[in-house]
Amino acid sequence: EEELQMIQPEKLLLVTVGKTATLHCTVTSLLPVGPVLWFRGVGPGRELIYNQKEGHFPRVTTVSDLTKRNNMDFSIRISSITPADVGTYYCVKFRKGSPENVEFKSGPGTEMALGAKPS
């Protein structure tokens, strides 16, 4: 089996208030089966940004069609950026578990920061 890797190519993403930010994440394997989630921050207080299996995330859309059975692109777009959105975003692979899924591997993170407004 190829070992799964989580790839977040940008260490830093400069964004503009009011615009849409794209956070990239790809995986190198579909296995083990389980969902990919996005969080801002780390540890017990991290904020869930997107969960592919459930929930309502009105400002978040996926770049790819996650219903494709061979999908390896879990990149997301966050619309209407505000200063409150700054932080480091992690895509995290979970493997299935009972009763709860188990965190399997995290990407290295992408720091979202505000760039200068265009003049």
Partner: antibody, heavy 118, light 107 residues
Framework: DVQLVESGGAVVRPGESLRLSCAAS????????MSWVRQAPGKGLEWLAG????????YYIDSVKGRFTISRDNSENSLYLQMNSLTAEDTAVYYC???????????WGLGTLVTVSS | ALTQPASVSANPGETVKITCSGG??????YGWYQQKSPGSAPVTVI????KRPSDIPSRFSGSASGSAATLTITGVRVEDEAVYYC???????????FGAGTTLTVL
């Protein structure tokens, strides 16, 4: 309420073609992958084909690959199964089913009966 | 191929377990589907190994471990008499597979 209603079942002769339809309502059809499952008389359930939400990716069981084509029209909230070169072994009730995020099924239609007989 | 017993029987109020083996835990999710008569629409009782739809009674539960999944009906009722099919989705092959079905008889 999620509703899936199949239609198009009929009695056909071996070698003929048939197109089944599944009308979906009560959910955002364009956000869900869909599948076709059949049940031959006195037999169990058999998954046939699946299609991604956008319709670009399709998946088939080997026994129908090349003969059956799954497709969808998201503007019409409809799923289709084009069946060619039918044989008596294709006689079955055909169900459409909505897929969960991990490609199992949560909602099913009532089914439509296809009979292939000379 | 997924393997499940052809039949099980129980008295009302008893606990019934139906097993489904043959999948690979690393690559397979399981679901369970109830069919009360041949040709009638199946009803999903469990998906994603252990997730129960909101309209399914809490006496139905699912679990998966190793290469097998289990459907448990705690306090079985006469109305639970049906054929129960397990299904697997294999993330290696992108294919869905059904077991042959288990006929539950409530005595």
């Amino acid at each position: 309420d999620v509703q899936l209603v199949e239609s198009g079942g009929a009695v056909v002769r071996p070698g003929e073609s048939l197109r089944l339809s599944c009308a979906a309502s009560g959910f955002t059809f364009s956000s869900y992958a869909m599948s076709w499952v059949r049940q031959a008389p006195g037999k169990g359930l058999e998954w046939l084909a699946g299609i991604s939400a956008g319709g670009s990716d399709t998946y088939y069981i080997d026994s129908v690959k090349g003969r059956f084509t799954i497709s969808r029209d998201n503007s019409e909230n409809s799923l289709y199964l084009q069946m060619n070169s039918l044989t008596a072994e294709d006689t079955a009730v055909y169900y459409c089913a909505r897929e969960t995020w991990n490609h199992l099924f949560d909602y099913w239609g009532l089914g439509t009966l296809v009979t292939v007989s000379s | 191929a997924l393997t499940q017993p052809a039949s099980v029987s129980a008295n009302p109020g008893e606990t019934v377990k139906i097993t489904c083996s043959g999948g690979d835990w690393y690559s397979t999710y399981y679901g369970w589907y109830q069919q009360k008569s041949p040709g009638s629409a199946p009803v999903t009782v469990i998906h994603s190994d252990d997730k129960r739809p909101s309209d399914i009674p809490s006496r139905f539960s699912g679990s998966a471990s190793g290469s097998a999944a289990t459907l448990t009906i705690t306090g079985v009722r006469v109305e639970d008499e049906a054929v129960y099919y397990c299904a697997g989705y294999d993330g290696r092959t992108y294919i869905n597979t059904f077991g042959a079905g288990t006929t539950l008889t409530v005595l």
